[in-house]
Amino acid sequence: LPAQVAFTPYAPEPGSTCRLREYYDQTAQMCCSKCSPGQHAKVFCTKTSDTVCDSCEDSTYTQLWNWVPECLSCGSRCSSDQVETQACTREQNRICTCRPGWYCALSKQEGCRLCAPLRKCRPGFGVARPGTETSDVVCKPCAPGTFSNTTSSTDICRPHQICNVVAIPGNASMDAVCTSTSPTRSMAPGAVHLPQPVSTRSQHTQPTPEPSTAPSTSFLLPMGPSPPAEGSTGD
């Protein structure tokens, strides 16, 4: 015969644990029901009555089955350099990510705590490593035979056009100028662009990220002005 199903609250057998979505209440010494995501424990269980759950209030949430007395507060509103990629609901926290042209300089949990503008490489420098969601652009000087005449977070160094007759030799920040009507070989008009950072969680992710064990808040404090790094501009 199948064992009789115990209804919460109940005293567990010695050495056994409570079932899924139940917890052991030390005071009552009983297995009691957890509250579902979006709820919290309004009244804890006793030996004779089960947990009383209540819905989370506005701007608060619980993401897991729980028996917390109060729901967690959602993070503050996303700042001007962020976009809200997940709204605050009773079951999930707000998640803010950096808007295009910015990267996340500080994120220890979901979302971003501190956004910073992607570095722009000045003329004579090109993008060596594009920015990602969590890393800044790396600039490098244009090698001999290449140039960049833009201030950009996406442009790489391009080869000088090859002339039949050179009017003005190219340098790191300027293309060669030809005297003939058309050069022997020329790059297509317009700057060469690297793709914008794709919306991945991190530049360095593990194949199977482990579940986060701590609640996330995602508010941001303003960054002050930054002096330009080598080969870059703060504009």
């Epitope: 994120s107 220890k108 949990q109 969590t134 360095h204 992710t205 990220p209 579940p211 986060s212």
Partner: antibody
Framework: EVQLVESGGGLVQPGGSLRLSCAAS????????MGWVRQAPGKGLEWVGS???????YYANWAEGRFTISRDNSKNTLYLQMNSLRAEDTAVYYC??????????????WGQGTLVTVSS | DIQMTQSPSTLSASVGDRVTITCQAS??????LAWYQQKPGKAPKLLIY???KLASGVPSRFSGSGSGTEFTLTISSLQPDDFATYYC????????FGGGTKVEIK
């Protein structure tokens, strides 16, 4: 007692590999962001890399591609796999536990360190 | 990468002195800065985090201030146990340490 204990250091030839371990007692490592910091003899502190609770990792530029941080929850241990070692990687390697929360990265619990010597 | 510059590199002081160490970031790091104390052969010890918050168990004679790019660690009255090397650390994703300040006996 809450503590971190590093092991796995020693003498290794240039180009060789080594795996450092950081075993925790008194705390559950899976609840904390963790990191590795090294210190060459007579020099200052240098960050190697950090790992978030969800498994996402960040590395110093010089460590990218050569060093890997992993964790075994069942053993409550953090690892640092070091490949293609160079003489300049000679240092005491410390593991550190982050203060918690989602603010800045700071280490408020450190191991005693393990010495890695890269020499032929 | 953000560069952290500490000054001075060495500081000679006497017990009871008020000591100030500065740390400059090459770009704004908001308040995300920590200070550590390290003694020879020992692991670093966290003193201050988020620029001004005192870590657990740290004496109140240690204090921190600053935001953006300029930060200061102050020891209000130097004690014999305070002779050590002090490091600042910016706490954003790609962590960076200052070069250190050795506080020695005058």
């Amino acid at each position: 007692e809450v503590q971190l204990v590093e092991s796995g250091g020693g003498l290794v030839q240039p180009g060789g590999s080594l795996r450092l371990s950081c075993a925790a007692s008194g705390i559950d490592l899976s609840n904390y962001a963790m990191g590795w910091v090294r210190q060459a003899p007579g020099k200052g502190l240098e960050w190697v890399g950090s790992r978030r609770t969800d498994g996402i990792t960040y590395y110093a530029n010089w460590a990218e591609g050569r060093f890997t941080i992993s964790r075994d929850n069942s053993k409550n241990t953090l690892y640092l796999q070091m490949n293609s070692l160079r003489a300049e990687d000679t240092a005491v390697y410390y593991c550190g536990r982050d203060v918690g929360g989602d603010g800045g990265w700071y280490f408020n619990l450190w191991g005693q360190g393990t010495l890695v010597t890269v020499s032929s | 990468d953000i560069q952290m510059t500490q000054s001075p590199s060495t500081l000679s002081a006497s017990v009871g002195d008020r000591v100030t160490i500065t740390c400059q970031a090459s770009q704004s790091i908001n308040i995300y800065l920590a200070w550590y104390q390290q003694k020879p052969g020992k692991a670093p010890k966290l003193l201050i985090y988020d620029a001004s918050k005192l870590a657990s168990g740290v004496p109140s004679r240690f204090s921190g201030s600053g935001s953006g790019t300029e930060f200061t660690l102050t020891i209000s009255s130097l004690q014999p146990d305070d002779f050590a090397t002090y490091y600042c650390q910016q706490g954003i994703n790609n962590i960076g340490f200052g070069g250190g300040t050795k506080v020695e006996i005058k």
